[in-house]
């Protein structure tokens, strides 16, 4: 799968939240961060993550779509200068300082099951999708026989008012 | 090339069923979500049905919920709706139309030519 | 819901004039918005994408743009060919289209 352009065809500031309405919050310690998985306090604030949507191009060998064998690929970023990364040796998701152009592991091929419930797959392991395990991010392997819309790879999306990326 | 083909549609008295089927071809079908759009004479456009890639997620416009059945075929790269209790007010041309990326249901990229539903005593 | 309204409903210019058509959400959409064209007894035909990408194929006069609740198509300069009603549709939250622009040659 090759990204088709180095920008983002759009982006988009959301708060990530699980099918269960638990936040994914990030906190920094000890110089780097930490992704976790909790219920917020009443008026708590959430965590913003910056989404780069960027087109990319099916391997011409797996679909017979041409130029229209389009996929979506997102980037997560929560702070500037880190994303989300896939660690798929350790099936762990990760949040990394990088510079761009970003690593394969900081690519996650958008699923959206309707509006603002999505889930990420992994551009470096096919079939392996970020989910929910025992309150933590992990990279959880979905066998094709199995419904996408398991809940612990199910995630939402909800607009932010506020265009800032911190 | 990317073609849908819409069949199924006609003249049809109020109440009654009807099946639409849209067949697709140029593209790999299993991995794209569908959808129904219809279009009523001289009018705008209007969404009435949506289903995900591997069949197991539908949408449907309000008016037509607990009345019409979106559903797919992978092997044979056909998409169908079911329309029951058929009304006046759904009579319009129906097209067929793909998503615009795998696995996604944003946007649709491609629209297949229509069959005219007329729901008339 | 999230209702789309488009303004004008009819728009008339001339050849070579530089046109421009709105559509307002009724909640932001985050961009998640597509513009279409459908010339008389044709299906639609999908021009623009999330806001401001061309689809393949499509001329270069066409662009979009926009953010939040306000979306604009311009064509730079309007052709014959151009004649059409245009629809803009979002997909931020649920499926919904426009009422559509007609436009027509002076």
């Known amino acids: 799968m090759s990204i088709t352009g180095i920008s983002p065809i759009t982006e988009y500031l959301a708060s990530l939240s699980t099918y269960n309405d638990q936040s994914i919050t990030f906190a920094l310690e000890d110089e780097s961060y930490e992704i976790y998985v909790e219920d917020l306090k009443k008026d708590e604030k959430k965590d913003k993550v910056l989404l780069s949507y960027y087109e990319s191009q099916h391997p011409s060998n797996e679909s017979g779509d041409g130029v229209d064998g389009k996929m979506l690929m997102v980037t997560l970023s929560p702070t500037k200068d880190f994303w989300l990364h896939a660690n798929n040796k350790e099936h762990s998701v990760e949040l990394h300082k990088s510079e761009k152009p970003l690593p394969d592991q900081a690519f996650f091929v958008l699923h959206n099951m309707h509006s603002n419930s999505v889930s990420f797959e992994s551009k470096t392991d096919p079939g392996v999708f970020i989910g929910v395990k025992d309150n933590h991010l992990a990279l959880i392997k979905v066998d094709s026989s199995e419904n996408l819309s398991t809940e612990n790879i199910l995630f939402k999306l909800s607009e932010t008012h506020h265009h800032h990326h911190h | 090339e990317v073609q849908l083909v819409e069949t199924g549609g006609g003249l049809v008295q109020p109440g009654r069923s009807l099946k639409l089927s849209c067949v697709a071809s140029?593209?790999?079908?299993?991995?794209?979500?569908m959808y129904w759009i219809r279009q009523a004479p001289g009018m705008g456009l209007e969404w009435v049905s949506s289903?995900?890639?591997?069949?197991?997620?539908?949408y449907y416009l309000d008016s037509v919920k607990g009345r019409f059945t979106i559903s797919r075929n992978n092997a044979e790269n056909t998409v169908y709706l079911q329309m029951n209790s058929l009304r006046s007010e759904d009579t319009a041309t129906y097209y067929c139309?793909?998503?615009?990326?795998?696995?996604?249901?944003?946007?649709?990229?491609?629209w297949g030519q229509g069959t005219l539903v007329t729901v008339s005593s | 819901d999230i209702q789309m309204t488009q303004s004008p409903s009819v728009l008339s210019a001339s050849v070579g004039d530089r046109v421009t058509l709105s559509c307002k959400a009724s909640?932001?959409?985050?961009?998640?918005l597509d513009w279409c064209q459908q010339k008389v007894g044709e299906a639609p035909k999908l021009l623009i994408y999330?806001?401001?990408n061309l689809q393949t194929g499509i001329p270069s006069r066409f662009s979009g743009s926009g953010s939040g609740t306000d979306y604009t198509l311009t064509i730079s300069s309007l052709q014959p060919e151009d004649v059409a009603t245009y629809f803009c549709?979002?997909?931020?939250?649920?499926?919904?289209f426009g009422q559509g622009t007609k436009v027509e040659i002076k």
């Open positions: 139309a793909k998503g615009h990326y795998s696995y996604s249901s944003y946007s649709f990229s491609y």
């Open positions: 140029g593209f790999t079908f299993s991995n794209y979500w």
């Open positions: 289903i995900n890639n591997d069949g197991g997620n539908t």
């Open positions: 909640h932001n959409i985050n961009k998640h």
């Open positions: 999330f806001t401001n």
């Open positions: 549709f979002q997909y931020n939250s649920g499926w919904t």
